[in-house]
């Protein structure tokens, strides 16, 4: 047992198995569930994280009104199919041959069908609206302090470039964080807004994905920001296709 083995961990994903058996004796970490090698300098894709989770043992308004095309993840957990890059495959099916199409964050965007269902491409989620309600505080948070703190959090904890945090809206007790990232804006090495939002969501729930880190301790000018409810809306580059019966 060497110091190198002690160092061989994945700081950004605790749902991994690591060993110094990579090229030239370098550390290599593999995601639970899929066995895929992961880059531990950045966030692991949501698809691989969901797969790992499923394999683990069980236990004058300033606020934005989500558009009619905004999706909420109502289906919850499922064991997804991921492509070789760790992204969601456009078509997902369960064990009973029920299939549906998903967007780049793995949220269903069509009615459920059978194995004949076609999903031609993985549609990108380019706009994410994170809607938070914070616990009562002595007074409202200062909007610009709150804005700066949330931008700092997304950069420093989730490695997301500040340019992708489009806006932070605040009407006590509701906070809305808008993340925007078009296909053309996302360069190699950039964290995906969907992955950042998922890590944030898990942090808020007290289920941090980071290795050996304490949970999220969010403070604005020393005042704790405690979230009591979270809703996340996903907007795709191409609107979803649901039949009318779902909308009634």
């Amino acid at each position: 047992h060497t110091a190198a083995q002690d160092n061989c961990t994945c700081p950004t994903n605790k749902m991994t198995v690591c060993s110094p058996d990579g090229p030239g004796g370098r550390c290599q970490c593999r995601a639970l569930g899929s066995g895929m090698a992961v880059d531990c300098s950045t966030l692991t894709s949501k698809c691989l994280l969901l797969k790992a989770r499923m394999s683990a043992p069980k236990n004058a308004r300033t606020l934005v009104r989500p558009s009619e095309h905004a999706l909420v993840d109502n289906d919850g957990l499922y064991d997804p199919d991921c492509d070789p890059e760790g992204r969601f495959k456009a078509r997902q099916c369960n064990q009973t041959s029920v299939c549906w199409c998903v967007n780049s964050v793995g949220v269903r965007r069509t009615d459920k069908g059978d194995l004949s269902l076609r999903c031609d491409e993985l549609v990108r989620t380019h706009h994410i609206l994170i809607d938070l309600r914070h616990r009562p505080t002595a007074g409202a948070f200062n909007h610009s302090d709150l804005d700066a703190e949330l931008r700092r959090l997304f950069r420093e904890r989730y490695r997301l470039h500040p340019k992708f945090v489009a806006a932070v809206h605040y009407e006590q007790p509701t906070i809305q964080i808008e993340l925007r990232q078009n296909t053309s804006q996302k360069a190699a090495g950039d964290v995906d807004i969907g992955d950042a939002a998922y890590y944030f969501e898990r942090d808020i729930k007290g289920e941090s994905l980071f290795q050996g880190r304490g949970g999220l301790d969010l403070r604005v000018r020393g005042e704790p920001l405690q979230v009591e409810r979270t809703l996340i809306y996903y907007l795709d580059e191409i609107p979803p296709k649901f039949s009318m019966k779902r909308l009634t």
């Epitope: 060497t2 110091a3 190198a4 160092n7 061989c8 961990t9 994945c10 700081p11 950004t12 991994t16 690591c18 110094p20 990579g22 004796g25 370098r26 550390c27 290599q28 970490c29 090698a37 992961v38 880059d39 531990c40 300098s41 950045t42 700066a148 931008r151 700092r152 950069r155 420093e156 490695r159 470039h161 500040p162 360069a187 090495g189 950039d190």
Partner: antibody, heavy 122, light 109 residues
Framework: QQLEESGGGLVKPEGSLTLTCKGS????????WMWWVRQAPGKGLEWIA?????????TYYASWAKGRFTISSTSSTAVTLQATSLTAADTATYFC???????????????WGPGTLVTVSS | FEMTQTPSSVSEPVGGTVTIKCQAS??????LGWYQQKPGQPPKLLIY???TLASGVPSRFKGSGSGTEFTLTISDLECADAATYYC????????????FGGGTEVVVK
């Protein structure tokens, strides 16, 4: 714990070279970033590239270095920097440095090599 | 993104105080390091996280600031403090920009 660069020397214009950074007293298999920084004679420090030496091998390059410089880590004890199409403007002391954290955006350099001088001249 | 360091050179007597400023063109929170470099040597880390003293660095060196404005203060100047000082951040490294300031030469009289 120390770092040492090698591979510097006199190179002809349009020539190429490979610089190597070796660590002793510690292993490159940790969860940190290794960096190359250069300093032209009498000038300031200029970042070239960095590589994550844990699981993944992510890299970042300075805009001006993309395409001409390549950082790599083929073993748990060495990081290399390959440079091509060298000009007199690339004459500098080249340092390798170890970043102190896993997060590339919150990095500072707590261990440096002594540097290796590269002179580009005909 | 740019790091602007001022002044480029400063001269103070032994026992005096030197203040070096570093300005980031965008908010970098507290992600700033300060380095000391003497001729023929590699830089040496003095301060990280804008204000935390690196191991073995005397308390005469003090870092402050956050956001876009940062300061390095060296008090009770000694002859050994004669060097060039650099500020540095990696906050916008993915933009391919140089995170080092231009340097400040400190001359101790």
């Amino acid at each position: 714990q120390q770092l040492e660069e090698s591979g510097g020397g006199l190179v002809k214009p349009e020539g190429s070279l490979t610089l190597t950074c070796k660590g002793s007293g510690f292993d490159f298999s940790g969860t940190y970033w290794m960096w190359w920084v250069r300093q032209a004679p009498g000038k300031g420090l200029e970042w070239i590239a960095c590589i994550y030496v844990g699981s993944g091998s992510s890299t970042y390059y300075a805009s001006w270095a993309k395409g001409r410089f390549t950082i790599s880590s083929t073993s748990s004890t060495a990081v290399t920097l390959q440079a091509t199409s060298l000009t007199a403007a690339d004459t500098a002391t080249y340092f390798c440095a170890r970043g102190a954290t896993n997060n590339v955006f919150m990095n500072y350099f707590n261990l440096w090599g002594p540097g290796t001088l590269v002179t580009v001249s005909s | 993104f740019e790091m602007t360091q001022t002044p480029s050179s400063v001269s103070e007597p032994v026992g005096g105080t030197v203040t070096i400023k570093c300005q980031a063109s965008e908010d970098i929170s507290s992600n700033l390091g300060w380095y000391q470099q003497k001729p023929g040597q590699p830089p040496k880390l003095l301060i990280y996280g804008a204000s935390t003293l690196a191991s073995g660095v005397p308390s005469r060196f003090k870092g402050s600031g956050s956001g876009t404005e940062f300061t390095l203060t060296i008090s009770d100047l000694e002859c050994a403090d004669a060097a060039t000082y650099y500020c540095q951040t990696s906050y916008y490294i993915d933009d391919g920009v140089n995170g080092f300031g231009g340097g400040t030469e400190v001359v101790v009289k």
